[in-house]
Interface confidence: low
């Protein structure tokens, strides 16, 4: 679909520009596989200019396509501590509202020890996103090694 | 924050749409981990709009927020040399000026002979990337697999 | 090169904001390397707003410096299934017009079951895209662990 | 072909160490574990250990505080060293190539018969 | 860590199907697909037969494949031959990072 007549004049407000970079905070309790993320210049180069953390989860506050990436890097971690820890997987998805509930991005980490992906995937207002990390081994929280972050891009 | 009023209208130069995707020229002398880059039409598919290369690396002309992207393949390499020559890390970060010196992507091989990864970060006008190699492993200088580039997303 | 003067507004639909995420459809019968993808919102979470899909393969609609990004996760797999039916290898390139053939992003699995990475790159209306999947192991065709994807980044 | 050759004392004398090594040849020894097994008379197989070149091992927990495996990369080899031996570590020991790409012992030595008696 | 569990012995005649099984935990052989075989004739060193639960390494006749389901991984012999006559092991990765072979099964033909 195209999206107005061609010389419809763009507000800057619409342009959206909703962007967020986290840095990792903890993980979860037992039995919670979420990580727990953290923002803001106060603590680094991690930031949220639109979405809003709620408990240590992204909640997306404007309708749109984004990019969605993010990097894990295990700590004390060495390819054959990764294969004897399979399977270690983390996934990224839409956790609550439980009807939108749906996984995003996927990926096990076998015999490495970071994974790195990025996705674009339609987001609503009010979408919190949880990425769950299974298995043993605990994640890095260097800064330069563990991130997570989506950028609006598109209505 | 939010932007501006709702309503003010946004001019072209102001998008920023600084970006730039480069390919791997050489790497750096001994005690170097330096990635040396090269960009532009000529060589094929890289190119510079707006940030401009410095000796080999990356210098932005625009203050805002970046998605940095990067993949490294490394040369005559299986997953038994790439264990075997660990630890090999590609480390990204600001170089100069020195008073802003900090790493922002770090990833390990491992039993792997490619990295690739992306994030957002916020970059001044002035700011270098550096892409330190560290190991002894060569990197590929096929334009497919090597690759570093980034994208003005916001201000 | 700056794009215009300073003042010039920027209509709406000039901003481009092409951008397509596809799933996996099904592999190509023997002999033929390619992936087939498939895309809207019948089927999920995917969408094309500007390309298009031909015969599975991605054709772009519109000029411009996009960011291509793929993960392709190798079904029924191990690190040991990967090292044992290595090399298996995904290249992502221009396939058509013939004259403008050329390989963008090119990944082996080595020891891992999933590839993910993302570049720059020119495109012009009328290329499409292929991505070519090398090697005897399978694509997982879950969409949260293999996707396709483009977004228009600038003119 | 990769072929690994081991050798060592044959009869020690309680709490004395055993002492054997392994040598490869034929192949990369960088890019694999290798490890200690052994079997009694008459029994079943025990792991008793692993190394990589880098020198990062892996041990049995039941026979940790008695184990030693180094490796010496210069000759590719690896050798095990059981302390304060007793008459129930008399086995035949086999030095084997741990294959992590298959999750296995894929090559194995020829095997030591080591008896502790006094 | 306790050995795996397999039979002590088990037989059959030349021709016949025999199956031996190998029972772990959830912390080895019901977590990894780190499963090996292994055929041992007296007085030789064992011989890779089966990996990564039912993989065949080159040379080995495709009558011995191999299983798995939930915490128990079972080798079978199809075609029983008088050459097939030795002690059989299992083995497995754990999660601690160690290997635990089987106590051995030896088979007989009849």
């Known amino acids: 679909q195209r999206f107005a007549q061609a010389q419809q004049q763009l507000p800057l407000e619409s342009l959206g520009w909703d962007v967020a970079e986290l840095q990792l905070n903890h993980t979860g309790p037992q039995q919670d596989p979420r990580l727990y993320w953290q923002g803001g210049p106060a603590l680094g180069r991690s930031f949220l200019h639109g979405p809003e953390l709620d408990k240590g989860q992204l909640r997306i506050h404007r309708d749109g396509i984004y990019m969605v990436h993010i990097q894990v890097t295990l700590a004390i971690c060495s390819s054959t501590t990764a294969s004897r820890h399979h399977p270690t997987t983390l996934a990224v998805g839409i956790c609550s509202p439980a009807s939108r509930s749906i996984s995003l991005l996927r990926l096990s980490f076998h015999q490495g020890c970071t994974i790195a992906s990025q996705r674009l995937t339609p987001l609503a207002r009010g979408d919190t996103l949880c990425t769950n990390l299974t298995g043993t081994l605990l994640p890095s929280r260097n800064t330069d090694e563990t991130f997570f972050g989506v950028q609006w891009v598109r209505p | 924050q939010r932007f501006a009023q709702a309503q003010q209208q946004l001019p072209l130069e102001s998008l920023g749409w600084d970006v730039a995707e480069l390919q791997l020229n050489h790497t750096g002398p001994q005690q170097d981990p330096r990635l040396y880059w090269q960009g532009g039409p000529a060589l094929g598919r890289s190119f510079l709009h707006g940030p401009e290369l410095d000796k080999g690396q990356l210098r932005i002309h625009r203050d805002g927020i970046y998605m940095v992207h990067i993949q490294v393949t490394l040369a005559i390499c299986s997953s038994t040399t790439a264990s075997r020559h660990h630890p090999t890390t590609l480390a990204v970060g600001i170089c100069s000026p020195a008073s802003r010196s900090i790493s922002l992507l770090r990833l390990s091989f491992h039993q792997g002979c490619t990295i690739a990864s992306q994030r957002l970060t916020p970059l001044a006008r002035g700011d270098t990337l550096c892409t330190n190699l560290t190991g002894t492993l060569l990197p590929s200088r096929n334009t497919d697999e090597t690759f570093f580039g980034v994208q003005w997303v916001r201000p | 090169q700056r794009f215009a003067q300073a003042q010039q507004q920027l209509p709406l639909e000039s901003l481009g904001w092409d951008v397509a995420e596809l799933q996996l459809n099904h592999t190509g019968p023997q002999q033929d390397p390619r992936l087939y993808w498939q895309g809207g919102p019948a089927l999920g979470r995917s969408f094309l707003h500007g390309p298009e899909l031909d015969k599975g393969q991605l054709r772009i609609h519109r000029d411009g410096i996009y960011m291509v990004h793929i993960q392709v996760t190798l079904a029924i797999c191990s690190s040991t299934t990967a090292s044992r039916h290595h090399p298996t290898t995904l290249a992502v390139g221009i396939c058509s017009p013939a004259s403008r053939s050329i390989s963008l992003l090119r990944l082996s699995f080595h020891q891992g079951c999933t590839i993910a990475s993302q570049r720059l790159t020119p495109l012009a209306r009328g290329d499409t895209l292929c991505t070519n999947l090398t090697g005897t192991l399978l694509p997982s065709r879950n969409t949260d662990e293999t996707f396709f994807g483009v977004q228009w980044v600038r003119p | 072909q990769v072929q690994l050759q081991q050798w060592g004392a044959g009869l020690l004398k309680p709490s004395e160490t055993l002492s054997l090594t392994c040598a490869v040849y034929?192949?990369?020894?960088?890019?694999?574990?290798w490890s200690w097994i052994r079997q009694p008379p008459g029994k079943g197989l025990e792991w008793i250990g692993e190394?990589?070149?880098?020198?990062?091992?892996n041990y049995n927990p039941s026979l940790k505080s008695r184990v030693t495996i180094s490796v010496d990369t210069s000759k590719n080899q690896f050798s095990l060293k059981l302390s304060s031996v007793t008459a129930a570590d008399t086995a035949v020991y086999y030095c084997?190539?741990?294959?992590?790409?298959?999750?296995?012992?894929?090559?194995w030595g020829q095997g030591t018969m080591v008896t502790v008696s006094s | 860590q306790s050995a795996l569990t397999q039979p002590a012995s088990v037989s059959g005649s030349p021709g016949q199907s025999l199956t031996i099984s190998c029972t772990g935990t959830s912390s080895d052989v019901g977590v990894y697909n780190y499963v090996s075989w292994y055929q041992q004739h007296p007085g030789k060193a064992p011989k890779l037969m089966i990996y990564d639960v039912g993989i065949r390494p080159s040379g080995v006749s495709n009558r011995f494949s191999g299983s798995k389901s939930g915490n128990t991984a079972s080798l079978t012999i199809s075609g029983l031959q008088a050459a097939d006559e030795a002690d059989y092991y299992c083995n497995s990765y754990t999660r601690s990072g160690t290997w635990v072979f089987g106590g051995g099964t030896k088979v007989t033909v009849l």
């Open positions: 034929g192949g990369s020894f960088s890019g694999y574990y």
């Open positions: 190394i990589n070149h880098s020198g990062s091992t």
């Open positions: 084997a190539r741990v294959s992590r790409s298959r999750g296995a012992f894929d090559i």
